[in-house]
Interface confidence: low
Amino acid sequence: EAHKSEIAHRYNDLGEQHFKGLVLIAFSQYLQKCSYDEHAKLVQEVTDFAKTCVADESAANCDKSLHTLFGDKLCAIPNLRENYGELADCCTKQEPERNECFLQHKDDNPSLPPFERPEAEAMCTSFKENPTTFMGHYLHEVARRHPYFYAPELLYYAEQYNEILTQCCAEADKESCLTPKLDGVKEKALVSSVRQRMKCSSMQKFGERAFKAWAVARLSQTFPNADFAEITKLATDLTKVNKECCHGDLLECADDRAELAKYMCENQATISSKLQTCCDKPLLKKAHCLSEVEHDTMPADLPAIAADFVEDQEVCKNYAEAKDVFLGTFLYEYSRRHPDYSVSLLLRLAKKYEATLEKCCAEANPPACYGTVLAEFQPLVEEPKNLVKTNCDLYEKLGEYGFQNAILVRYTQKAPQVSTPTLVEAARNLGRVGTKCCTLPEDQRLPCVEDYLSAILNRVCLLHEKTPVSEHVTKCCSGSLVERRPCFSALTVDETYVPKEFKAETFTFHSDICTLPEKEKQIKKQTALAELVKHKPKATAEQLKTVMDDFAQFLDTCCKAADKDTCFSTEGPNLVTRCKDALA
């Protein structure tokens, strides 16, 4: 229904706390360089204005759209051009072009320092002094670094953060209470960020239909007892929610997500028997819980998929009468039978089925032509299954760090032109798939591995789009989202690459490395490894292992030495010489 004042409507629906949080996230995602204080001031002004509209919907400007109100606020910021360059040109446009312009200027890799966590005592002090400001800083810092973070989910993580601080700041040993818990939230939030970015990419590049297909597959796996009409309704609603969040309409997105959660909890009987635990929780926890609820038990009486989609003599007629509905039903029926497949794989199978019908239904004897379609799925299914087996075996053999290094070598050979920091970030993220997925039961491994890899590779594509340097990467990133992972997996050594000159300074280290946290040390070593591969793309695994072992031993020796600086300055050049010899 239409409301006289959109901003009053959203303020009433969401309540002041969530309203303020979402407006802060929206501003931080649009203007990523502004300080917290600048944004907090704008948020307060918008909130005060919303309250006047709640009191009187006919008050001046209350009838304006949220894009107009928010855009006007952002465009009124002083020194916009000095700080944001051409983003200031957006302010010369009218809505909806102005909002589109802001969206296009979102930076997936902003040049901001890493979000450093203060030490426990300081954190607890500032949290106790002003919990609201503390949480505001958290929302601001995460949102500006992740401009597509799913806003209602970020509110959930802020709530988690709040609960952890409330609990741990009351303990004697704050540090050991906070560190593992906050690390856990950070890890989950980072995964949530890349997954949501993938959804927004799907929406931006391929439209709502592509996202809806993803949603149908995912929901059918989770809710195999829901009928197609129910799955279609949920997929349609979920598509709307995600479209709004990806489009910067965060108040509408959060409001509609709450509505969807409410609908699911009111209709458990026709959706799933596993929802009750989630539905007993308060709003943010409920919606989060529903988004990762376990799969319902599959119905026992499901007929073979072939009955309707291969053996029925009227397949082509059914397909011609309602193509999207027929293909949607195929995706639904196949997905509900295969919770053990990744969504990417299910979408590839649906695509193959569609291509087969397009070809066969134009022939003289369609049933003879499409009769073998399910058998033709076999290689498509085997490929990711083999990928999972090979990579999980390797992970079990090498551990996370060793597995990351193996991936780093592989990907540097595939795309040596890509910048070393991007390769290291990608390899570290791809390598985490082992810890995340390889320990799961067999039937959960494939969906976990492939859908996670797809999300990480989407980030690789986004970063590469900014400064395209590798034809290999461009080729894989230009195709459809579901084909990306197989495309990257199939890449081999880039034969067109001219090896990098050997520069001694790239492999020169100083004693300051010794005091770095373990993660930073690993990144330094992995940076050196990528540079080695760029120098010798065809180096064997044995050669690279020799060099890296030597390097690790050198660091270990010098970091234990009484005079670290002398050790680094004398042993360093010897290491460089040995590296060159080993790779010659």
Partner: nanobody, 126 residues
Amino acid sequence: EVQLLESGGGLVQPGGSLRLSCAASGRYIDETAVAWFRQAPGKEREFVAGIGGGVDITYYADSVKGRFTISRDNSKNTLYLQMNSLRPEDTAVYYCAARPGKPLITSKVADLYPYWGQGTLVTVSS
């Protein structure tokens, strides 16, 4: 378990109309794919019309398209077949059939329907 009970059959002249009903119990009719089949004396059972589970997408045999209309009333848990411009070759026992598992697609294959009514006879003759 779904029980189906047809009614509405009878004798009608060529060009006339009849409306068959199929009352379902044991499961909501909108949760299953439902169809009408018919069997003329000495012939095989053939698909007439079907409607998908959950979404009202309808399918018809070529021989009845434009003359017959399948519909359902969820509040009464009943399936209907409105038959207009009847011909002598429409004479047969008409059966109502249901498929659980809520499939959208109504198959033309009789074997895929586990639940059947006892049938109602339609005779078209002058």
